[in-house]
Interface confidence: medium
C-alpha cells in the first residue's frame, strides 16, 4: 500500500527556496512525479486540512503543516499524476499528460534554528501588562513576509522601535536582530531596511489602515535573550529612524528557470519575483559558483557545470540583476534597462 503516511514513502517539496514549502512530488515507479491538486476527487481550488500531511512534514524534518492546497502552475513539462481513492494514497494514479495540472502545494513550518523564547515571560515586579510580549513585522510591498518595520507589543501597549545612530554603533554584532528574526520564526537577520524602503514599500491601502501606534520603544539591552528585557518605553518621536528588518525567511523568494537550451538543465537564466519572467543580468557580485549551484538545484538538475556571460553589445537589452551572491538572498531584483549581459548556465543532467 502506497501512502504519504508510510514511514518509507519518499516525498519532496520543490519549486521553492525552502525545503519546507513547495509543490509536492512523490517517488513511485522509479521516478519523481508532481501531484496534481485535482487528485482524490478534489476540485483544483480546494484547500485541505493541512494536518492530514503532518507525516510528510515530519519526514522532511520540518515543523507542523500550515497549508495544503493548489500551488503556482509550472511551465516546465514534467511527469504529473492525478491520484484516486483516499487523500494521501498513491496506489491508484494516472499520468495527466496534456491536462492543466495545478500542482498540490504543502507548507510546513520552518524548523527553528535557535531555542524559542519562553511562551510566558517570568513574573515581573509590576502587575501590568499581563499578556506575554510579542513582535510583529508590518507587511511590505506585495505582502512580503519576514521583512518590514518591527513592532513590539507588551500587554495592550504596542509601537515601533526607535533605532538611532548610537544603536547602530553599539550593535555591530547584530545579536538583537538575529534574536528578533528568530523570535518571529523568520530565520536569521539579513539586513536593515532603510526607513524609506520599509515605509514606501507598504501598500497605500495598508498604510491608511495602519495608524501610528500610541507608544514607542527604544533598545534597552541588545544582548537580551527574552523579549521583555529587550526594549523600554519612551515618549513617541516624530523624527528619527525606526527598526526595520529583513530576515532570511522572507517571501516571496526569487524563482529561476533555464530557457533556450537543448535540455532542461541548460539555458539562459531567467528570474521572477512576482508575475513576470525576465533575463538575469550578469553581476560582479556573482563571480563564485554559489549562485549557479543554487539555480541548478532549483531546476532539480545535477551540480553546476559552467556559465558563460553573453555579449551585452545591445544597448536595449533589458533584464533583472541581484546584488547578492545567491538569489535566495535577494530581497529585491533591480531592473536593468540597458546593456544587460545575459548568462548561459549548464548544469549536469540527471537523466542524460
Amino acid at each position: 500500500r502506497l501512502s504519504w503516511d508510510d514511514p518509507d514513502f519518499q516525498t519532496r517539496l520543490t519549486r521553492s527556496n525552502s525545503r519546507c514549502q513547495g509543490q509536492l512530488e512523490v517517488y513511485i515507479k522509479y521516478g519523481w512525479h508532481m501531484v496534481c491538486s485535482q487528485s482524490w476527487g478534489r476540485s483544483s481550488n480546494q484547500w485541505e486540512d493541512p494536518n492530514q500531511a503532518s507525516k510528510v512534514c515530519q519526514r522532511l524534518n520540518c515543523g507542523v503543516p500550515l497549508s495544503l492546497g493548489p500551488f503556482l502552475i509550472t511551465d516546465r513539462h514534467q511527469s504529473q499524476i492525478t491520484c484516486y481513492g483516499r487523500l494521501g494514497s498513491f496506489s491508484n494514479c494516472s499520468h495527466s499528460g496534456r491536462d492543466v495540472c495545478r500542482p498540490l502545494g504543502l507548507t510546513c513550518l520552518e524548523p527553528q534554528t535557535t531555542t524559542p523564547p519562553p511562551t510566558r515571560p517570568p513574573p515581573t515586579t509590576t502587575p501590568e501588562p499581563t499578556a506575554p510580549p510579542r513582535l510583529q513585522l508590518v507587511a511590505q510591498a506585495a505582502g512580503r513576509h519576514c521583512a518590514g518595520v518591527v513592532e513590539f507589543y507588551s500587554g495592550s501597549l504596542g509601537g515601533t522601535i526607535s533605532y538611532e545612530a548610537q544603536d547602530k554603533a553599539q550593535d555591530k554584532t547584530q545579536v538583537l536582530e538575529n534574536f528578533l528574526c528568530s523570535s518571529l520564526q523568520c530565520g536569521s537577520f539579513l539586513k536593515h531596511l532603510p526607513e524609506t524602503e520599509a515605509a514606501t514599500a507598504q501598500d497605500p491601502g495598508e498604510l491608511r489602515e495602519h495608524q501610528p501606534l500610541p507608544i514607542q520603544w527604544t533598545i534597552r539591552n541588545s544582548s537580551c535573550t527574552s523579549l521583555e528585557h529587550c526594549f523600554r518605553k519612551i515618549k513617541p518621536r516624530n523624527s528619527g529612524q525606526v527598526l526595520a528588518l529583513l530576515c532570511s525567511g522572507f517571501q516571496p523568494k526569487v524563482q529561476s528557470r533555464l530557457v533556450g537550451g537543448s535540455s532542461i538543465c541548460e539555458g539562459t537564466v531567467e528570474v521572477r519575483q512576482g508575475a513576470q519572467w525576465a533575463a538575469l543580468c550578469d553581476s560582479s557580485s556573482a563571480k563564485s559558483s554559489l549562485r549557479w549551484e543554487e539555480v541548478c538545484q532549483e531546476q532539480q538538475c545535477g551540480s553546476f557545470n559552467s556559465y558563460q556571460a553573453l555579449d551585452a553589445g545591445d544597448p536595449t537589452s533589458r533584464g533583472l540583476s541581484c546584488p547578492h551572491q545567491k538569489l535566495s538572498q535577494c530581497h529585491e531584483l533591480t531592473e536593468r534597462k540597458s546593456y544587460c549581459k545575459k548568462v548561459f548556465v549548464t548544469c549536469q543532467d540527471p537523466n542524460p
Epitope: 519549486r15 521553492s16 514549502q21 513547495g22 509543490q23 483544483s44 481550488n45 497549508s67 492546497g69 493548489p70 500551488f71 503556482l72 502552475i73 509550472t74 511551465d75 492543466v100 495545478r102 502545494g105 507548507t107 507587511a139 506585495a142 505582502g143 512580503r144 513576509h145 517571501q251 516571496p252 528557470r257 521572477r272 519575483q273 512576482g274 508575475a275 513576470q276 519572467w277
Partner: nanobody, 122 residues
Amino acid sequence: EVQVVESGGGLVQAGGSLRLSCAASGDTICISAMYWYRQAPGKAREMVAAITSGGSTYYEDSVMGRFTIFRENAKNTVYLQMNSLKPEDTAVYYCNADIAGHNCSGYLKEYWGQGTQVTVSA
C-alpha cells in the same frame, strides 16, 4: 480584491471569428495562469484553453487549431481568438485567473468573471 471581467462575446455566423478579452484588475501582482472555460446550456463547465505566466499554452482537443490563447502581461489581460467557429461552440465563456494571494508565496486562489455569451448560428 481581484476583479475579472470578460468582453467580446456576441452573435456570429458559423465559420466566422470572435476575439474575447479578459482583464484582471486589483491585487494581480502574482497571476500564475489564466484560463478560458465555457458552459453550454445543460452541460458542465469545461476548460477551453489556458496560458501560464511563462507562456505555456493548453487547449481542449475540440478547439485545437481553431482557437488561440495569448496574454498581454503588462495589462494583466488574456485573449481568446476564436476562428472557424461552429454552432457547437455556442456557450457562455468564462475567464478564470489563478492568483497567488497578496503575499506571492505560491498558493493560489481562483477568480472568475461573470461570463460573456457567444452564439454561433448555422
